[in-house]
């Protein structure tokens, strides 16, 4: 058995095996936003769909209120893109103008709450500079990697300016996880 | 096992358990692409490399025709990196002139075709306005999320201009699926 | 049992079985590059942090020297995103008075060493060309897919300029591996 | 500005049930962990139990855990320490915390006698 | 449960003296928490993860160990360092902490 040394008289198990279909695991996809208050120098948090569509939650992975909660301790992988999309006009111009376009810069943020410490840990940070030419813009912005996480932990999303964030399609827009 | 009370007794399986190595996985790489018909309003798809290279296809997973083949029903992680590359003027200059300049944008879907729905699902889209200054552009979009998929699903990556395709390298362009 | 059928008189073992806790996984995050001599035409290697923080290796997954190290065959999950950041002026300016602007691009590469074969093998590629409005940018370049690995096979990320790969947070830069 | 204010009665009957509510201004409780600790005349800090306000999921101290409900109100931004069966050894002054989403915030606790 | 123990139970020492307060947990811990208490007042925490400085507090309070073994210093006492210090462990459960150590002006 895998874990284990194969040997005709004896097995010496080095650790549980688990069936991975009943892996906790969720795949979240966008919603339209409400504006909620976030405190200052804190960015907002998203919230999703984890039913309808695409969207989904098992295995004692729920979501709840802007987080998904880790039922069980290990590794996972993480994963969120998040869409932008706004209007820009010439940025050298403005520049020159002394008037700093709005945005500057696009981020996201995947965040861990836990127990276990007292501030939110930031696991993952995209961000990038927007200063488009051309009137209309969009561009997404995607992380994934592997986190060791406890039971007990929430993940949640956070994004530079929530007016920005493409809400139109589950496909444009998502987060999820799932344990290794 | 994992997965279950732990008794001296008998045990009680709830799932189960699979070796890794026997799962359904691929990795297909980029080919250059043969002008193919398409339907108007619905994005070409590229093929691939199964092979050669880097590229491989395993158990049961199978490349045809631009589709992966989904053989078994589960939860698959699947992800795709495109890289675009294409020429440009200034875009302001000939956006003020009234010619919107080609690219207005460079978009990856990679969507499910499933004999249980009539059309095909979008179910990744990474899309971003492209109007760069300078005269040669180039840049990837990456997706990648978990989903599940039914045994017969078929997977393809759809673009919106397949001429503008980097098929020059491997390590460039590239999609892959497998199942967790 | 996983990968046997269920019968109640016997097993038919198709493939070892093995605990997903013990898989080889790192993720490594960014530390603060010191200049290295690196070969002509070739991109110079990152190094990384493997035990504070949010970086970890296990279950004989090592890193040393800019290398992770594979400690046994099979399919793997490999990841990176690096950020970078730079400062340029209006590059169309630059371009027509016949001095390109530094960066054109930037560019990640996720290269293999195997003593196997003479040459590295770039496995991913992430490139863009970079032509920012505006004085400073940054953007993050973000590539994963799975690779066939060998045991002794070695795994590093390579940048065309590592003095615009930002440094600062470990959850802007990283690199990871798992045994699928 | 973050505020915890632990608010119930300062007397309880043996017997009876310690009931302590805590109201938080300034922060989203959804976005941390509230715990409770508890402080005995002269001794140290006790950890009592907390409860995730997003989920209701709880842990107790196991020597308590037969004892003590924690449950929360988060229309109202509110937890809520419930200890059954009290004795003397049950006076304290009691904090509720708040931790994982801020950095550590206690109110300013409630002194509760247990006498007859 | 994972035992914090708590060395000295208290001090004397002088405005200026570097001053050092061990703990030792019965089993490894990944973070360690440092909490001051002045009487009548909620504690106030220091230190969190074992060597990180909580939003405002003076610099010269510092942590440092990992394991089984932490250390807590104040490199330069002041006057108004007088009060009891607390370490304490948030993984295992029940959250433990030390038995406190009183830290007085000679």
């Known amino acids: 058995l895998k874990g284990q040394e194969f040997a005709p008289s004896h097995q010496q198990v080095y650790a549980p095996l688990r069936a991975d279909g009943d892996k906790p695991r969720a795949h979240l996809t966008v919603v339209r936003q409400t504006p909620t208050q976030h405190f200052k120098n804190q960015f907002p948090a998203l919230h999703w769909e984890h039913e309808l569509g695409l969207a989904f939650t098992k295995n004692r992975m729920n979501y709840t209120n802007k987080f998904l909660l880790i039922p069980e301790s290990g590794d996972y992988f993480i994963y969120s893109q998040v869409t932008f999309r706004g209007m820009t006009s010439e940025c050298s111009e403005i520049r020159q103008a002394g008037r700093p376009n709005k945005p500057d810069s696009i981020t996201v943020v995947i965040t861990k709450v836990t127990d276990s410490y007292p501030e939110p840990t930031q696991l993952l940070m995209g961000t990038k500079s927007v200063c488009e030419v051309g009137s209309n813009w969009f561009q997404p912005i995607y992380l994934g990697a592997m986190f060791s996480l406890q039971e007990g932990d929430k993940l949640m999303v956070n994004v530079s300016d929530i007016s920005l964030v493409d809400y139109t399609k589950e496909d444009k827009t998502f987060f999820g996880a799932f344990l290794l | 096992l994992k997965g279950q009370e732990f008794a001296p007794s008998h045990q009680q399986v709830y799932a189960p358990l699979r070796a890794d190595g026997d799962k359904p996985r691929a990795h297909l790489t980029v080919v250059r692409q043969t002008p193919t018909q398409h339907f108007k309003n619905q994005f070409p798809a590229l093929h691939w490399e199964h092979e050669l290279g880097l590229a491989f296809t395993k158990n049961r997973m199978n490349y045809t025709n631009k589709f992966l083949l989904i053989p078994e029903s589960g939860d698959y992680f699947i992800y795709s990196q495109v890289t675009f590359r294409g020429m440009t003027s200034e875009c302001s200059e000939i956006r003020q002139a009234g010619r919107p300049n080609k690219p207005d944008s460079i978009t990856v879907v990679i969507t499910k075709v499933t004999d249980s729905y009539p059309e095909p699902t979008q179910l990744l889209m990474g899309t971003k306005s492209v109007c760069e200054v300078g005269s040669n552009w180039f840049q990837p979009i990456y997706l990648g999320a978990m989903f599940s998929l039914q045994e017969g699903d078929k997977l393809m990556v759809n673009v919106s201009d397949i001429s503008l395709v980097d098929y020059t390298k491997e390590d460039k362009t590239f999609f892959g699926a497998f199942l967790l | 049992l996983k990968g046997q059928e269920f019968a109640p008189s016997h097993q038919q073992v198709y493939a070892p079985l093995r605990a997903d806790g013990d898989k080889p996984r790192a993720h490594l995050t960014v530390v603060r590059q010191t200049p290295t001599q690196h070969f002509k035409n070739q991109f110079p290697a990152l190094h990384w942090e493997h035990e504070l923080g949010l970086a970890f290796t296990k279950n004989r997954m090592n890193y040393t020297n800019k290398f992770l190290l594979i400690p046994e065959s099979g399919d793997y999950f490999i990841y990176s995103q690096v950020t970078f950041r730079g400062m340029t002026s209006e590059c169309s300016e630059i371009r027509q008075a016949g001095r390109p602007n530094k960066p054109d691009s930037i560019t990640v590469v996720i290269t293999k060493v195997t003593d196997s074969y003479p040459e590295p093998t770039q496995l991913l590629m992430g490139t863009k060309s970079v032509c920012e409005v505006g004085s400073n940018w940054f953007q993050p370049i973000y590539l994963g897919a799975m690779f066939s690995l060998q045991e002794g096979d070695k795994l590093m990320v390579n940048v065309s300029d590592i003095s615009l790969v930002d440094y600062t947070k470990e959850d802007k830069t990283f690199f990871g591996a798992f045994l699928l | 500005q973050v505020q915890l204010q632990e608010s119930g009665p300062g007397l309880v009957r043996p017997s009876q049930t310690l009931s302590l509510t805590c109201t938080v201004s300034?922060?989203?409780?959804?976005?941390?962990?509230m715990h409770w600790v508890r402080q005995r005349p002269g001794r140290g800090l006790e950890w009592m139990g907390r409860?995730?306000?997003?989920?209701?999921?709880?842990k107790y101290n196991p020597s308590l855990k037969s004892r003590v409900t924690i449950t929360r109100d988060t229309s109202k931004n509110q937890v809520s320490l419930r200890l059954s069966s009290v004795t003397a050894a049950d006076t304290a002054v009691y904090y509720c915390?708040?931790?994982?989403?801020?950095?550590?915030?206690w109110g300013q606790g409630s002194l509760v006698t247990v006498s007859s | 449960d994972i035992q914090m123990t708590q060395s000295p139970s208290s001090l004397s020492a002088s405005v200026g003296d570097r001053v050092t307060i061990t703990c030792r947990a019965s089993?490894?811990?990944?973070?360690m928490y440092w909490y001051q208490q002045k009487p009548g007042k909620a504690p106030k925490l220091l230190i969190y993860?074992?060597?990180n400085l909580a939003s405002g507090v003076p610099s010269r309070f510092s942590g440092s160990g990992s394991g089984t073994d932490f250390t807590f210093t104040i490199s330069s006492l002041q006057p108004e360092d007088i009060a009891t210090y607390y370490c304490q462990q948030w993984e295992g459960n029940p959250r433990t902490f030390g038995q406190g150590t009183k830290v007085e002006i000679k």
């Open positions: 409860i995730d306000p997003a989920s209701g999921h709880t």
């Open positions: 300034g922060f989203d409780i959804d976005d941390t962990y």
């Open positions: 993860g074992a060597s």
């Open positions: 915390v708040m931790s994982g989403g801020a950095p550590d915030v």
């Open positions: 089993q490894g811990v990944m973070y």
